[in-house]
């Protein structure tokens, strides 16, 4: 049998060692013990007796099915206990009694049906993170389950086979920063929502089929809910259930962020937020994020005119990888407060973008992200966006553009342009001179000779440049990132000619370790201040005898350098 490996600070690794029991020879010097992925099955009362100073104990996926009642009695210093993904079909309060220092407890993925006969956690007054439940058997949440817990940073409950939720079970925890609920359906959602309304700041609902969700007024007094963020991940919605969900918002007046991630909408966007009060109650929502929204009938999707008024005050919208091909002009015009819009990984083309960015569209927009769409003409794109008078930042990376022309028009306030991964081979004066930040990384550029008088940051990594660009092109440059090109050398004169340069990232190039380069690096210890990833990413490519050596360590031969 293999043994533990421990370092000087008492951190011991026993993962995947085929242990069939807790190994012998544990000592009080151990601070952290990881016995995950073993076949331990049983923890006896003396097995951990010697570990009086243990702070971290990780026993996940070790096939444990039995733990003696007093197995953890000597672990008064324990702060982190992970028993996840074992075979514990019942849980005992006697395990946790001695663990008064515990801050993190993971009991998830064990096949218990309830959290035990009596309250498990009354002594865990320092607990900050608790993870419980499983996919298949955890079926009941009761009032006694969380007794003794008053405040948690994170609570995660996997209750994907929940059959009974005893009203007020979660109410005893007065403050929960982040609650993650895995519920397969909405049966108990209203009851749970009522119980957590006054305690949870961030509610994350996972894997829930909300297709049959129906609102009914909550049995709560006037509450001031601290909830700021609400996220749905892997949920299923219909047009009708979306309308019903909106009615919950009247109880969370401080809500500022809503997120839908990997959700399915079995509908056409025929939303009808009938309650006029819902509109005013969305007033504080500033950020709406939608990622990977699957709409089986997306080609029949409505124009969303019924929710225009809901979104008038929203400042940040992300709709990513969701088959968006058009934001109707009238919708864009209603997004009066929008400052940030991210439409990455969608189906936008110039023709429809023109409609989206019509006159009066997105009047407050400062940042637009159109990365990985189907844009082809840089010139057309710039022209279309001239309507956006406040646009300062544009990301059109990961679109495959035709070669750029010599001149283009862009919104006059634009300061940041991302053209990375667009297949460009040559940069021309199409790029606006007003830029302060330009990203052209991951393209096919073998030179860069464009004068950009205001440019402060240039990102040009993963191209084919053989030398650093001429410093006179960028009189106020502060940052240049030029990793993974074909740069063979840089000199004192080159670096000195960038008067304001503070950061240069030039690692992973093909450095020719000449006498000049090596003597420069040896004589200039201050390089470490300016070069990012120095010295590890700066390696000699040639001559052959120095190949793979760090520039810092390479020594030129006396013969070569003093001929």
């Amino acid at each position: 049998q293999e043994s533990l490996s421990c370092d000087a600070s008492g951190v011991c690794d026993g993962r995947s060692r085929s242990f069939t029991s807790i190994p012998s020879g544990l000592t009080a010097a151990m601070k952290s013990l990881d016995l995950s992925f073993n076949k331990i099955t049983y923890i006896g009362h003396g097995d951990l007796r010697a570990c009086a100073n243990l702070q971290v104990l990780i026993l996940k996926s070790s096939r444990i099915n039995t733990i003696e009642g007093d197995a953890f009695y000597s672990l008064g210093s324990l702060e982190h206990l992970d028993l996840s993904d074992n075979h514990l079909s019942s849980l005992s309060s006697s395990w946790f009694g001695p663990l008064s220092s515990l801050k993190y407890l993971n009991l998830m993925g064990n096949p218990y049906q309830t959290l035990g006969v009596t309250s498990l956690f009354p002594n865990l007054t320092n607990l900050q993170t608790l993870r419980i439940g499983n996919v298949e058997t955890f079926s009941e949440i009761r009032r006694i389950d969380f007794a003794g817990l008053t405040s948690l940073n994170e609570l995660e409950i996997k209750a994907l086979s929940l059959r009974n939720y005893q009203s007020q079970s979660l109410k005893s925890i007065r403050d929960i920063h982040h609650l993650t609920l895995h519920l397969s359906e909405s049966a108990f959602l209203l009851e749970i929502f009522a119980d957590i309304l006054s305690s949870v700041r961030y509610l994350e609902l996972r894997d829930t089929n909300l297709a049959r969700f129906q609102f009914s007024p909550l049995p709560v007094d006037e509450v001031s809910s601290p909830m700021k963020k609400l996220a749905f991940r892997g949920s299923v919605l219909t047009d009708e259930s979306f309308n019903e969900l909106l009615k919950l918002l009247r109880y969370i007046l401080e809500l500022s962020e809503v997120e839908f991630d990997d959700c399915t909408l079995n509908g056409l966007g025929d939303f009808n937020p009938s309650e006029s009060d819902v509109v005013s109650e969305l007033g504080k929502v500033e950020t709406v994020t939608i990622r990977r929204l699957h709409i089986p009938q997306f080609y029949l999707f409505y124009d969303l005119s019924t929710v225009y008024s809901l979104l008038e005050k929203v400042k940040r919208i992300t709709v990513e990888n969701s088959k968006v091909f058009l934001v109707p002009c009238s919708f864009s015009q209603h997004l009066k407060s929008l400052e940030f819009l991210d439409l990455s990984e969608n189906l936008m083309v110039e023709e429809y973008l023109k409609n989206s960015a019509c006159k009066g569209a997105w009047p407050s927009l400062q940042t637009l992200v159109l990365s990985q769409n189907h844009l082809r003409s840089m010139q057309k794109t710039g022209e279309i966006l001239l309507t956006l008078k406040n646009l300062t930042s544009l990301d059109i990376s990961r679109n495959t553009f035709h070669p750029m022309p010599d001149s283009c028009q862009w919104p006059e306030k634009m300061r940041f342009l991302n053209l990375s991964s667009t297949g460009i081979r040559v940069v021309k004066t199409c790029i606006p001179q007003t830029l302060e930040v330009l990203d052209v990384s991951n393209n096919n550029l073998d030179s860069f000779s464009l004068f950009l008088p205001r440019l402060q940051e240039l990102y040009i990594s993963r191209n084919k440049l053989k030398t650093l660009p001429d410093a006179s092109l960028f009189p106020v440059l502060l940052v240049m990132k030029i990793r993974e090109n074909a740069v063979s050398t840089f000199s004192k004169d080159q670096l000195g000619s960038f008067p304001k340069l503070e950061t240069l990232e030039a690692g992973d190039n093909h450095f020719v370790c000449s006498c000049e380069l090596l003597s420069f690096t040896m004589e200039t210890p201050a390089l470490a201040q300016i070069l990012v990833d120095w010295p590890d990413s700066y390696l000699c490519d040639s001559p052959p005898r120095l190949h793979g050596h760090r520039l810092q360590d390479a020594r030129p031969s006396v013969l070569e350098c003093h001929q």
Partner: nanobody
Amino acid sequence: EVQLVKSGGGLVQAGGSLRLSCAASGRTFSRYIMGWFRQAPGKEREFVAVINRSGGSTDYASSVKGRFTISRDNAKNTVYLEMTSLEPEDTAVYYCAAGEYYTGSSSRYDHWGQGTPVTVSS
């Protein structure tokens, strides 16, 4: 209506690997949560793994976690169960199932495959 057809079972030595697949007919495959269950002789049917509609979420029974991997290909209307480090205790008839709810509770699945036997010899 979704019909489920399975393949890939058989006899394997302890420590070996097998890949089960379950092909669905019909064009609505991507609307379903897919699960794998198994039933050993003389025992109740038990949950093995579940995957959501997009493939972005997966969950496993603790007895197979780290050894089995569930995946799906919506373009091919197929769900897979990759089984490695097989043990004699994994011997059972394996079923794939389709339903509307992401759960390990077999009663919530509406459509079932016919089952394929897996025998792990020591």
